[in-house]
């Protein structure tokens, strides 16, 4: 009679003797910023310490009746989901609760900020093991709250937050929109996005992943043995906080970037029905449902990458969009996407000592997205090699000429308003290792990296007839680092990576007609690190 949500986050390959972090999160402390809680509930008794922190606004309405069990309801349930004895994810994790939400579930930005500062000070006074902070709350976008989350994350704390229950773009809310925070949307037992009345889970590029968030059984503050079912992105975030505690207990040295990459890597892929999301948000919303790793061993050898979408550039002629990787991640490739197809490509450029991915809108375009492929590559030395537009009809080429450097991604950027009006090259060179090729009117940018044991290969998939989507995937053991389209495809809307698959999107085929120009070739660059593989074998 295991609750559906706990069954869902347990991978199919799970074996009880294989995934056993020390007492299921016992090395980790989880801070919960929420309502008050019933700490003597049997599910969490002895596992949750109620701090003396309280910063809440007055309840609305003169006739509001403060009933303890109602005041404690939300927080008690979430504490149970994280670390409850019976229905908890990380049954060994200890928790500390801070009251930042009142009996009506309302809080203030200032109260949350002071709560975060309280945690920071506690961490400085008495440093413990890894810390996870669960923020099961969402309010309007707040630059100051996002900045506070960034500061705490850069101090080594893992922050997990609810995407929000407004059936809206999570980027419009805080702390969900803070890039340093792990933002969680909610799915149900059918792996569908959760509907809550007329609203439901938030979505979009600011969501990192989804987790069970409907009909979640957990501790009820009604009585010491009571259980209740609750729904929402708060419950989903609590699952991820629990999974994070399990992972950190098994590998206490994991950085935030490493943890996020692992959460993404071990998630169930492509199980959510995207039709629930607004059409313009489907491509931006990760189709990922959180799960525990099947094993804590052997994860170290993997080359982990994730896709980061920028905000929309807006429609102005010179508008650009920028996608950034986290401080500990390497930008291994950069691509762009425009629903109208009017774009001027993308390029990698240095900004504040780090590479960023910038996409350029074109005249008459409705705007573009920049798409960064962000990877964990220890001891990497990456640079961008650029070739200006070529005079020859063969098109522009650029390769990695430094000894020991391999090609991880190709980008192209052009100044002409619409490359589609220019006849493509007669000869279309095939993709070659360590070489990017593009239109003669375009600048071509090659991302070249040197890292111990890094090897990469180019994989292509071409379709002669027009298709709205062409994909090419990296095989088992290889990780997609670069995704682009070969030149000669005048109607390409853009390219982007979805997990380990490179997707090249084209205009609706009915508008382009079936000509030789309709041919679409998706080019994937697949990499692996022999060094990481050897290192993990030595550890075992």
């Amino acid at each position: 009679s295991i609750p559906w949500n706990l069954e869902r986050i347990t991978p199919p390959r799970y074996r009880a003797d294989e995934y056993q972090p020390p007492d299921g999160g016992s090395l980790v402390e989880v801070y919960l910023l929420d309502t008050s809680i019933q700490s003597d509930h049997r599910e969490i008794e002895g596992r949750v310490m109620v701090t003396d922190f309280e910063n809440v606004p007055e309840e609305d309405g003169t006739r509001f009746h403060r009933q303890a069990s109602k005041c404690d309801s939300h927080g008690t349930h979430l504490a149970g989901v994280v670390s409850g004895r019976d229905a908890g994810v990380a049954k060994g994790a200890s928790m500390r609760s801070l009251r930042v939400l009142n009996c009506q579930g309302k809080g203030t930005v200032s109260g949350t900020l002071i709560g975060l500062e309280f945690i920071r000070k506690s961490q400085l006074v008495q440093p413990v093991g890894p810390l996870v902070v669960l923020l099961p709350l969402a309010g309007g976008y707040s630059r100051v709250l996002n900045a506070a989350c960034q500061r705490l994350a850069r101090a080594g704390v893992v922050l997990v937050t609810a995407a929000g229950n407004f059936r809206d773009d999570a980027c419009l809310y805080s702390p969900a929109s803070a890039p340093e925070v792990i933002t969680v949307g909610a799915t149900n037992a059918q792996d569908q996005p959760v509907t809550l009345g007329t609203l439901g889970t938030n979505f979009g590029r600011c969501v990192d992943l989804f987790a069970p968030g409907e009909d979640i059984i957990g501790a009820s503050s009604d009585c010491s043995t009571c259980f209740v079912s609750q729904s929402g992105t708060s419950q989903a975030a609590a699952h991820v906080a629990g999974i994070a505690a399990m992972m950190l207990s098994a590998e206490p040295e994991l950085t935030l970037a490493e943890l996020r990459q692992r959460l993404i890597h071990f998630s169930a892929k492509d199980v959510i029905n995207e039709a629930w999301f607004p059409e313009d948000q489907r491509v931006l919303t990760p189709n990922l449902v959180a799960a525990l790793p099947p094993s804590t061993h052997g994860a170290g050898w993997q080359l982990f990458c994730r896709t980061v979408w920028s905000a929309h550039s807006g429609p102005t002629r010179m508008a650009t969009a920028v996608a950034r990787c986290a401080p500990d991640e390497e930008l291994l490739s950069c691509s762009s996407f425009s629903r109208s197809g009017k774009r001027r490509g993308e390029r990698m450029e240095a900004q504040g000592g780090k590479l960023v991915c910038r996409a350029h809108n074109a005249f008459g375009g409705e705007g573009v997205y920049a798409i960064a492929r962000c990877c964990l590559l220890p001891q990497a030395n990456c640079s961008v090699h650029t070739a200006p537009p070529a005079e020859a009809s063969m098109g522009t080429r650029v390769h990695c000429h430094q000894q020991g450097h391999v090609l991880t991604g190709c980008s192209s950027h052009w100044e002409v308003e619409d490359l589609g009006t220019h006849k493509p090259p007669v000869l279309r060179p095939r993709g070659q290792p360590n070489q990017c090729v593009g239109h003669r009117e375009a600048s071509i940018h090659a991302s070249c990296c040197h890292a111990p044991g890094l090897e990469c290969k180019v994989k292509e998939h071409g379709i002669p007839a027009p298709q709205e989507q062409v994909t090419v995937a990296c095989e088992e053991g290889w990780t997609l680092t670069g995704c682009s389209a070969l030149p000669g495809t005048s109607h390409v809307l853009g390219a982007y990576a979805v997990d380990n698959t490179c997707v090249v999107r084209s205009r609706d085929v009915s508008t382009t007609g079936s000509t030789s120009e309709g041919a679409v070739t998706a080019v994937a660059i697949c990499c692996r690190s022999r060094h990481l593989a050897q290192a993990s074998q030595e550890l075992q």
Epitope: G46, R85, D86, D222, S224, T225, V228
Partner: antibody, heavy 119, light 113 residues
């Protein structure tokens, strides 16, 4: 089948120590709470406390706090009730029983252990 | 603590007749979270451990004859044996399991008249 098997009857003198056991089988021992219940001769049932074998956390009835110690060894699916210094008033039948979050009532009981304390 | 009070203390009923035992809790054991009453009934025969008969105030445990039924809500509960059989001679206990310490009624002894 699911069962809780308790250790045999004990006859002790006042001041002696004692540890009685309750072994679970036929189910996942760490998924259930084990409670101990006292029944003095000719009297009713009194709940003494529970232990969660998964983390060995205990919760005692205030009336029994400090009088007895509840423990468990999950590796052998066994819970224990012990006294460091028995009194004549500890003479009773002691039962173990199991419950869990979805079934918080006692659905399976041990056969009981009779403890007699007499000088 | 929640105090459980049973009535009567003992009951003598003819074979085939109805036996009714009452149980009152000092505070409600009905909770809105799942709309359930956290109350159980147990039967204890001489020399045996208690046996679960009824849980959630009215749900019969599997294998328990259907002549046993539970009813009531909030603070007042009843165990009914619709047609007393010889094997039903025992002491019956009600129990609340919503808060600690868990408490039992003092017991009702059922005999054959």
């Amino acid at each position: 089948q699911v069962q809780l098997v308790q250790s045999g009857a004990e006859v002790k003198k006042p001041g002696e120590s004692l540890k009685i056991s309750c072994k679970g089988s036929g189910y996942s021992f760490t998924d259930y709470y084990i409670s101990w219940v006292r029944q003095m001769p000719g009297k009713g049932l009194e709940w003494m406390g529970w232990i969660y074998p998964g983390d060995s956390y205990t919760h005692y009835n205030p009336n029994f706090q400090g009088q007895v110690t509840i423990s468990a060894d999950k590796s052998i699916s066994t819970a224990y009730l012990q006294w460091s210094s028995l009194k004549a008033s500890d003479t009773a039948m002691y039962y173990c029983a199991r419950d869990r979050w979805s079934t918080p009532y006692f659905d399976v009981w041990g056969q009981g252990t009779l403890v007699t304390v007499s000088s | 603590d929640i105090v459980m009070t049973q009535s009567p203390d003992s009951l003598a009923v003819s074979l085939g007749e109805r036996a009714t035992i009452n149980c009152r809790s000092s505070q409600s054991v009905l909770y809105s979270s799942n709309n359930k009453n956290y109350l159980a009934w147990y039967q204890q025969k001489p020399g045996q451990p208690p046996k679960l008969l009824i849980y959630w105030a009215s749900t019969r445990e599997s294998g328990v004859p259907d002549r046993f039924s539970g009813s009531g809500s909030g603070t007042d509960f009843t165990l009914t044996i619709s047609s007393l059989q010889a094997e039903d001679v025992a002491v019956y206990y009600c129990q609340q399991y919503s808060s600690f310490p868990i408490t039992f009624g003092q017991g009702t002894k059922v005999e054959i008249k």
